[in-house]
């Protein structure tokens, strides 16, 4: 069964800066990745970035840099201030569209006990939805 993992890290040097990393553990070919915050995309969440392996990358503030790390993982740097700044309990979600597995989505947030600059290991997060 495919799995999606989500890792959220707050940068020690900039407390309003977050790095989100997501990965897909499956054998299929990824056709689209959508990163959102505030909940799953389409269920109250707001899209931060969309990454298409053959067409490119689209991002919206406060996303600063979305990129592919490998064929099956992505990272996103967020920088914000004021209303557009993420906070420690913000939920980030990643949805991977893959053939032939379909769409798989998982969410994560900053570990409650983590200090800035520390992060939880990138273990698979609970799968919230598989279309």
């Amino acid at each position: 069964t495919p799995e999606v993992w989500v890792q959220v890290r707050m940068e020690a040097t900039e407390l309003s800066s977050f790095t989100i990393r997501c990965g897909f553990l499956g054998s299929g070919s990824i056709s689209l990745v959508t990163v959102s915050w505030g909940g799953p995309n389409g269920a109250g969440g707001t899209t931060l970035a969309v990454l298409h392996p053959e067409r490119g990358i689209r991002q919206w503030a406060p996303a600063r840099q979305a990129r592919w790390e490998t064929q099956s993982s992505i990272s996103l740097i967020l920088e914000g201030s004021g209303a557009s700044s993420p906070c420690a309990n913000t939920t980030f979600c990643c949805k991977f569209a893959s053939f032939p597995e379909g769409s798989w989505e998982a969410c994560g947030s900053l570990p409650p006990s983590s200090d800035p600059g520390l992060s939880a290991p990138p273990t698979p997060a609970p799968i919230l939805r598989a279309d």
Epitope: R55, R58, T70
Partner: nanobody, 118 residues
């Protein structure tokens, strides 16, 4: 399918300048890496310069200080300002785009000829 169309090539004297442009058909997504390559007659295609959508730039040593690569993300357009041109810069210049930055799918333009001659 991303289409790339170059323009701006031509004949120029040594020491002169040219500005190449490359327009991409993709208007929704940013192309992660865009670059210029060139192929001189009888030689292999070689990298000239690349730029990511976040602005990271790379130049091959032979053009550093003479060529400037830039891009307009809003238009997904790529530019190459070429100054102090030399005879050895004569080549067909190709625009290249790697949307993911991973090389999974790479697109090429048809090329534009630059001739440096007196």
């Amino acid at each position: 399918e991303v289409q790339l169309v170059e323009s701006g090539g031509g004949l120029v004297q040594p020491g002169g300048s040219l500005r190449l442009s490359c327009a991409a058909s993709e208007t929704y997504f940013d192309l992660y890496v865009m670059g210029w390559y060139r192929q001189a007659p009888g030689k292999d295609r070689e990298l000239v310069a690349t730029i990511t959508y976040t602005g990271s730039i790379y130049y091959v040593d032979s053009v550093k200080g003479r060529f400037t690569i830039s891009r307009d993300n809003a238009k997904n357009s790529l530019y190459l300002q070429m100054n102090s041109l030399r005879a050895e810069d004569t080549a067909v210049y190709y625009c290249n785009a790697d949307p993911s930055g991973l090389g999974r799918k790479v697109y090429w333009g048809q090329g534009t000829m630059v001739t440096v001659s007196s």
